[in-house]
């Protein structure tokens, strides 16, 4: 066989579908690897071929498109299952070729089972809702292309195991689920079940997503440095260990990068010769506000180190702040034996 551009197994596109439900899977070549679409390829005389390797097998085999009721079919660049079976799990390959050109990519397809409460090994998308905000909506995901716009499906929404009907703050509105007000208790999994007819058969699409209620942008503030502060002085003798925590609170901000760093005499610790270590810990509130603590540690501090400027910096999408730690050398306690002896005239 002639050479083929093999993009290998595209594990980034780990496709998971529910057992006994329709699934439409687009060939990833046109979405992620090639610079032209299926229509262009088709009109240029290229043919799209599908084959697969069953789970725990090495043998590539053609896909059987002659199953009863057209259970598996291909339409343009889409592989259709109407519906899936558990043993459809495997690696699928789509290959685009003619006599002079060949390109192919494989991707894993996992058919998963769900229980009556929609629990499954499916990786769930996360949708963040703001607390103390107005009406917010989530939309039943990945149902486009399953039925024509002339078909009016029925949609049922569930919160965990419970059908959403007359809920306190959640209203089903077709493909959307409206949260009149998002409470922390709304955290959890929400499932839409879309039921539609096709050629005398009834199909169900189950889509589950995780809702996480997070801090509102209305309440977001620039980073707040709790430590160091003006009330604490780090007083050390040379040879002692110096430990200074920098503790910073960050409001939740969608897609914000929260950063904390120390400077010593205006330089990053990496750029100076002191033997300094920095340990970081991160904790989150119920609404994903973040507290970061970076502890600056110098095992055996010198008198020179105690004269340096130690500044904690923090930055988020809301702004940048800095605070210097108050560091000083401890004044040695008087040595009473010598002083008393001098007081009695001893030399």
């Amino acid at each position: 066989s002639e050479r083929c551009d093999d993009w290998g197994l595209d594990t980034m596109r780990q496709i998971q579908v529910f057992e006994d439900e329709p699934a439409r899977i687009k060939c990833p070549l046109f979405e992620h690897f090639l610079k032209f679409n299926y229509s262009t390829a088709h009109s240029a005389g290229l043919t799209l071929i599908w084959y697969w390797t069953r789970q725990d097998r090495d043998l590539e085999e053609p896909i059987n498109f002659r199953l009863p009721e057209n259970r598996i079919s291909k339409e343009k660049d889409v592989l259709w299952f109407r519906p899936t079976l558990l043993n459809d799990t495997g690696n699928y390959t789509c290959m685009l070729r003619n006599t002079t050109y060949c390109s192919k990519v494989a991707f894993p397809l996992e058919v998963v089972q769900k229980d009556s409460c929609f629990n499954s090994p499916m990786k769930l998308p996360v949708h963040k809702l703001y607390i103390e905000y107005g009406i917010q909506r989530i939309t039943c995901p990945n149902v486009d292309g399953y039925f024509p716009s002339s078909v009016k499906p029925t949609i049922t929404w569930y919160m965990g195991c419970y059908k959403i009907q007359n809920f306190n703050n959640v209203i089903p509105e077709g493909m959307n689920l409206s949260f009149l007000i998002a409470l922390i208790s709304n955290n959890g999994n929400y499932t839409c079940v879309v039921t539609y007819p096709e050629n005398g058969r009834t199909f169900h699409l189950t889509r589950t997503l995780t809702v996480k209620v997070v801090g509102s942008p209305k309440n977001a503030v620039p980073p707040v440095i709790h430590s160091p502060n003006d009330h604490v002085v780090y007083e050390k003798e040379p040879g002692e260990e110096l430990l200074i925590p920098c503790t910073v609170y960050f409001s939740f901000l969608m897609d914000s990068r929260n950063e904390v760093w120390w400077t010593i005499d205006g330089k990053k610790p990496d750029d100076i010769t002191i033997d300094v270590t920095i340990n970081e810990s991160i904790s989150h509130s119920r609404t994903e506000d973040e507290t970061r603590t970076q502890i600056l540690s110098i095992k055996k501090v010198t008198s020179e180190d105690l004269k340096r400027s130690y500044v904690c910096h923090a930055r988020s999408a809301k702004g940048e702040v800095a605070k210097a730690a108050k560091v000083k050398q401890k004044v040695p306690a008087p040595r009473y034996t010598v002083e008393l002896a001098c007081g009695f005239g001893a030399t």
Partner: antibody, heavy 119, light 107 residues
Framework: EVQLVESGGGLVQPGGSLRLSCAAS????????VHWVRQAPGKGLVWVSR????????QYAESVKGRFTISRDNAKNTLYLQMNSLRAEDTAVYYC????????????WGQGTLVTVSS | DIQMTQSPSTLSASVGDRVTITCRAS??????LAWYQQKPGKAPKLLIY???SLESGVPSRFSGSGSGTEFTLTISSLQPEDFATYYC?????????FGQGTKVEIK
């Protein structure tokens, strides 16, 4: 600390009207919603109505639908319950209560105002 | 509407007793349940929310448990100020509904 104070209760004849107020002192009402809950003499608590803080969406118990109207004046930091076509069975102490913005709970309650419907 | 059934309706107990009040929902309400204490002539006071979370400022002798349809409020060691009526409240489904109340009185 926000406090809620109800007023406007009193004696009214069947078929009459009354407007209850619930004023917040010590800060804005806040929360996710404000509710009216009533308690007939010697009886338990019954939810009546609510208005959402962020969208003015309202909801009513079936027994008061079409007769009671909940509203609010943000500038005055006050909630209202307009009660029309009052019946003897509406006789109760009426409480306003704030729904928390974090969890489903009524975390702040007013002291209540007594409405008596009698001829 | 969801029916909330509390038991017992009246409970006679002494100071220091461990007291348990049960609340049953006619359908599952997850953990969307609160407990309130009410004394004569006063407004209800929130004790427990989210079925088991203690409201700030409420003594730790009060605790809540349960999920779905069965819930309990426990007072580990009854104090003189705890003699009152207790209500459970479901907040998942509209209309909100309360239990009929449990009166805790001195034995």
């Amino acid at each position: 600390e926000v406090q809620l104070v109800e007023s406007g209760g009193g004696l009214v004849q069947p078929g009459g009207s009354l407007r209850l107020s619930c004023a917040a002192s010590g800060g804005t009402i806040g929360g996710s919603a404000v509710h009216w809950v009533r308690q007939a003499p010697g009886k338990g608590l019954v939810w009546v109505s609510r208005i959402l803080t962020y969208s003015s969406t309202t909801q009513y118990a079936e027994s008061v639908k079409g007769r009671f109207t909940i509203s609010r004046d943000n500038a005055k930091n006050t909630l209202y319950l307009q009660m029309n076509s009052l019946r003897a069975e509406d006789t109760a102490v009426y409480y306003c209560a704030r729904g928390s913005s974090e969890y489903p709970k009524f975390d702040i309650w007013g002291q209540g105002t007594l409405v008596t419907v009698s001829s | 509407d969801i029916q909330m059934t509390q038991s017992p309706s009246t409970l006679s107990a002494s100071v220091g007793d461990r007291v348990t009040i049960t609340c049953r929902a006619s359908q599952s309400i997850s953990s969307w349940l609160a407990w309130y204490q009410q004394k004569p002539g006063k407004a209800p006071k929130l004790l427990i929310y989210d079925a088991s979370s203690l409201e700030s400022g409420v003594p730790s002798r009060f605790s809540g448990s349960g999920s779905g349809t069965e819930f309990t409020l426990t007072i580990s060691s009854l104090q003189p100020e705890d003699f009152a009526t207790y209500y459970c409240h479901q907040l998942l489904i509209y209309p909100h509904t309360f239990g009929q109340g449990t009166k805790v009185e001195i034995k």
